[in-house]
């Protein structure tokens, strides 16, 4: 019951996290700037991974997409890549984890298969969360290092003088959404990995042959001594008595009514 709850909760937390990563990736408010050298009107600029917007106090708003790929800063491309990888891994992880859920029965899927799928999805969620956190952190670092340092540098360029506009760059809402969403996906992934341990059937380190009486007459077949000592052809502990002897694995997988006598 606890395993099912852990797995289910991990799935839900990861689902919320991945939805958040998608939302953050699509949002325009990754960085926000107040262009406060403007004598006319308060101008507010905000930028995302895909487009840049200008909003004025008069109510005018205009957004423009980054339609080029080659000319953009390498850091921006890296952040885009990290976020997309995070989304793709998260989406695949969600798909895998749906089939891995203990509460969902699909054919005769064994617990060991579900455990493996749960672990796979858990690892995918962890990597997805780390990608999102890394992407957001790289962008935040880019803002701090590149922009807060550069205010009012003047130099002469073609066609006259050029100066960097004094702007106050701040972290946009998307950064916080991304950090929280990445964290949730990471936590969900860890929960799935924990649930996987509970789902996996415990394996013994030895293969013991257990003998059970399955009927009134147990017919002896030659080769029994070979199996018990480990000599000869029957080294894999295959069934050597018609109804009586089974390996430990077979006992777990196919219990008969006689096993409980």
């Amino acid at each position: 019951m606890a395993v099912t709850a852990c797995q289910g909760l991990g799935f839900v937390v990861s689902l919320i996290g991945i939805a958040g990563i998608i939302a953050a990736t699509c949002m325009d408010q990754w960085s926000t700037q107040d262009l406060y050298n403007n004598p006319v009107t308060a101008v507010f600029n905000y930028q995302g991974l895909w487009r840049s917007c200008v909003r004025e106090s008069s109510g005018f708003t205009e957004c423009r997409g980054y339609f080029t790929l080659l000319g953009l800063p390498a850091m921006l491309q890296a952040v885009r890549a990290l976020m997309i990888v995070g989304i793709v891994l998260g989406a695949i992880g969600l798909l895998v984890s749906i089939f891995a859920l203990k509460c969902i029965r699909i054919g005769s899927m064994e617990d060991s298969a579900k455990a493996n799928m749960t672990l796979t999805s858990g690892i995918m969620f962890i990597v997805s969360g780390l990608c999102a956190i890394a992407g957001v952190s790289v962008f935040a670092n880019m803002l701090v290092t590149n922009f807060w340092m550069s205010t009012a540098n003047m130099y002469t360029g073609m066609g006259g003088m050029v100066q960097t506009v004094q702007t106050r760059y701040t972290f946009g809402a998307a950064l916080f959404v991304g950090w929280v969403a990445g964290g949730l996906t990471l936590i969900g992934g860890v929960m799935m990995c924990i649930a996987c341990r509970g789902l996996a059937p415990e394996e013994t380190n030895y293969k013991a042959v257990s003998y059970h009486a399955s009927g009134h007459s147990v017919a002896y077949k030659p080769g029994g001594f070979k199996a018990s000592t480990g000599f000869g052809s029957n080294t894999k502990n295959k069934k050597i008595y018609d109804g009586g002897a089974r390996t430990e694995d077979e006992v777990q997988s196919y219990p008969s009514k006689h096993d409980y006598v």
């Epitope: 006319v40 200008v54 066609g159």
Partner: nanobody
């Protein structure tokens, strides 16, 4: 990389009119505010008029009612219609633009043109 080229300056009689143009070209991503500044001989550069991308305009008190600033966002061009010109309007008129570059759409720059001379004299 980016050029602001002013045109339309010249010699005009007091009470006359002139229309200045400023064309921005190069690897521009987005132009925000654009403005006209002037510098008379021996004086400091002063704001004449400025206009935002959305069309909000502001004028220096000395030119209010006489000058009109406008812009064409699709052509990245700024205009200044100057009417009822006076001798004190004689100056080098500079075009100014706050813009992003395509290569760095996260940083804002102010570019200045090299100026066009307006002489108001009889």
């Amino acid at each position: 990389q980016v050029q602001l080229v002013e045109s339309g300056g010249g010699l005009v009689q007091p009470g006359g009119s002139l229309r200045l143009s400023c064309a921005a070209s190069g690897s521009i991503f987005l132009i925000n505010a654009m403005g006209w500044y002037r510098q008379a001989p021996g004086k400091q550069r002063e704001l004449v008029a400025v206009i935002t991308r959305g069309g909000s305009a502001n004028y220096a008190d000395s030119v209010k009612g006489r000058f009109t600033i406008s812009r064409d966002n699709s052509k990245n061009t700024l205009y200044l219609q100057m009417n009822s010109l006076r001798a004190e309007d004689t100056a080098v008129y500079y075009c100014n633009a706050d813009l992003n570059l395509r290569s760095d759409p996260f940083k804002w720059y102010t570019f200045w043109g090299q100026g066009t001379l307006v002489t108001v004299s009889s």
